[in-house]
């Protein structure tokens, strides 16, 4: 009966070696790409000339195969019933599922104009900064290959600054060759509650980039949550992507390859402002920006990102305040093709599929001081690129769940 | 309140170096450039170059370059500028002045008077 | 490099007249003028600043105009504490530069 259902359940959902939790926790089963999609700008020189509003046109997908490696460092440790591994980072590009190829040339900001004038506010340095500037022959805007753009490439600016700083550039460098963690979670063996919950990312349980509540490592990493899930919840998970912890609520009853499986979305409210939602009060770090806390629909990362004005948003500024999108043209947000979420087995906590979206933007301000920048009316918030990872069980895996899992119950 | 202290006057044989200090107070060091002029005897005003103690980020006047040196000791919260090769072209007294937020020498030492005599 | 050409080189004027100093820039350097009084054995002092800024404790009798390539700065009221030496200078380019000076005497 429904008693042995979930002894086994909970004896299989268990991360530790010979459970089938353990075998598709350690190497993904399922193949997860992530598309991008990259904001062409195309009136560079009216935006720097002019202040005019920014005119971009989205160009995708390119595609990407990730998460194909497996959990490196993977360390039980009997004694708190956690078990702490590395995630390691990859990228294989698919050309069959992309618009082009990786040498597609893009105008976007450029990154390390906008950056250094953002991290350096002193006048003086500012100064400095705009001799290399005008040396490099670089702009506000400049022209890189997708290659460049994600992965890195040397800066010509960067490269003349005469005291020690990273002159490779890229939106997602380093990348390859990465890992991400250590995580440290629990693997339920005590207590099935609590399995996949991270207990410690990078050894701490907070994270340093918030103040109060907003701090927290919450929930799992979304792979998989404790079993049984219920309609009702509120489920927490962490992404370093984003550098926060956030969380996903019941939408709909979904059929998945004959799998009833919950989908659970990020709503709204987790991106309102303060104002709106008043949790979210901590998540608002500066008071210019976001209009004393009245914009929303944008999270200021850079104390992440080693000070670079690096703002998240959901694709197309979706659910984001008008203030942020005003000075951009061409987006067009909707919920189906940009919202978050995860469809997710209830028995088991498996997250079977999934389609994380979420938009890289940066910051750029006038610079007095910096002749690029120098006739800019306003600050804008400039979307460099959104994407999309997905990941959808296999139909081998499925009917194994089916047969195993699911059917055993109906 | 800011203020800059300067070591004091110095007489130098031609040929030689010196190295002025501007001691620094009342107010986070790190954070504020320190730029240096020259005035020469009943003339005008000539910026040398600025140093940034954040991260030590420097500029000189063309001019200058090769003869002055500009560092900065975080600790003592104390800017330095050496002057090398002296020659009577160099005899003046050399101010030390600091930037307040987006204000430009808002801040002087009293200057030190350098002369160079055989 | 931009060069700053002020003058005159000398005034001569009566207490309660009207003090005028001119710097005209070789570049287009927008509002990022400054300007210094000293007074001998002294250091400069800053009185405007970038953006035609009278800076604060500054008599309101000092004010300065200007954009671009032409900058004037005014005494409305000379006042026999105001005889010094005065100094503009540019802070859109490196190298700053400053203009020549101009030394106020009481006539």
């Known amino acids: 009966g429904d008693l042995l259902i979930q002894k086994t359940i909970k004896k299989q959902v268990v991360l530790e070696e010979g459970t089938i939790a353990f075998k598709n926790w350690v190497k993904t089963g399922t193949e997860v790409y992530r598309q991008f999609w990259i904001f062409d700008v195309q009136n560079p020189q009216e935006v720097m000339m002019n202040s005019s509003n920014i005119q971009v046109k989205q160009r995708g997908p390119y595609t990407y195969r990730v998460r194909f490696l497996a959990k490196e460092n993977v360390t039980q440790d009997a004694e708190d019933n956690t078990v702490s591994f590395l995630q390691p980072n990859g990228a294989i590009f698919e050309p069959s599922l992309s618009v082009g190829t990786e040498a597609d040339n893009f105008t976007v900001l450029n990154l390390a104009v906008a950056a250094a004038s953002h991290i350096y506010q002193n006048q003086f340095v500012q100064m400095i900064l705009n001799s290399l500037i005008n040396k490099s022959k670089s702009s506000m805007f400049q022209v890189r290959t997708l290659r460049e753009l994600l992965w890195g490439y040397r800066d010509p600016f960067l490269s003349l600054v005469p005291y020690p700083v990273t002159t490779t550039v890229g939106l997602f460098y380093p990348y390859n060759n990465t890992a991400d963690g250590v995580y440290k979670v629990f693997n339920g063996k005590d207590n099935i509650s609590k399995v996949a919950i991270i207990d410690t990312y990078k050894g701490k349980r907070n994270l340093s980039y918030w103040e109060s509540h907003c701090d927290m490592i919450n929930g799992t990493d979304a792979a998989s949550f404790p079993p049984f899930v219920e309609k009702s919840q509120v489920l927490q998970f962490f992404s370093s992507d984003i550098c926060r912890s956030i969380y996903a609520v019941f939408e709909s009853d979904v059929n998945l390859k004959g799998i009833p499986v919950y989908r659970f979305v990020l709503p709204s409210k987790a991106f309102a402002s303060p104002v709106e939602n008043p949790d979210n009060y901590c998540f608002c770090t500066e008071k210019i920006i976001s209009k004393n806390c009245t914009s929303y629909g944008v999270l200021d990362i850079s104390k992440c990102k080693e000070g670079r004005p690096v703002y998240i948003s959901l694709p197309h500024f979706l659910y984001a305040s008008p203030d942020v999108s005003e000075p951009i043209d061409g987006l067009n947000p909707n919920e189906e093709e940009h919202r978050t979420y995860l469809d997710i087995e209830p028995i088991t906590g498996f997250t079977l599929q999934f389609a994380k979206r979420l938009q890289v933007n940066l910051l750029v301000k006038p610079s007095e001081k910096i002749q690029v920048l120098k006739n800019l009316k306003r600050n804008y918030i400039v979307p460099i690129l959104w994407l999309n990872e997905t990941g959808t069980i296999g139909d081998e895996k499925a009917n194994m769940f089916r047969s195993q899992v699911t059917g055993k119950i109906n | 309140e800011v203020q800059l202290q300067q070591s004091g006057p110095e007489l130098v044989k031609p040929g030689a170096s010196v190295k002025i200090s501007c001691e620094t107070s009342?107010?986070?060091?790190?954070?504020?450039?320190m730029h240096w002029v020259k005035q020469s005897h009943g003339k005008s005003l000539e910026w040398i170059g600025g140093?940034?103690?954040?991260?030590?980020?420097?500029k000189y006047n063309q001019k200058f370059k090769g003869k002055a040196t500009l560092t900065v000791d975080k600790s003592s919260s104390t800017a330095y500028m050496e002057l090398r090769s002296l020659t009577s072209e160099d005899s003046a007294v050399y101010y030390c002045a600091r930037d307040r937020y987006d204000v430009w020498f808002a801040y002087w030492g009293q200057g030190t008077l350098v002369t160079v005599s055989a | 490099e931009t060069t700053v050409t002020q003058s005159p080189a000398s005034l001569s004027m009566a207490i309660g007249e009207k003090v005028t100093i001119r710097c005209i820039t070789s570049t287009d350097i927008d509002d990022d003028m400054n300007w210094y009084q000293q007074k001998p054995g002294e250091p400069p002092k800053l009185l405007i600043s970038?953006?035609?800024t009278l800076r604060p404790g500054v008599p309101s009798r000092f004010s300065s105009s200007g954009y671009g390539t032409d900058f004037i700065f005014t005494i409305e009221n000379m006042l026999s504490e105001d005889v010094a030496d005065y100094y503009c200078l540019q802070s859109d380019n490196l190298p700053l530069t400053f203009g020549a000076g101009t030394k106020l005497e009481l006539k």
């Open positions: 970038e953006g035609n």
């Open positions: 009342g107010h986070t060091f790190t954070e504020y450039t």
């Open positions: 140093i940034y103690p954040n991260n030590g980020a420097t």
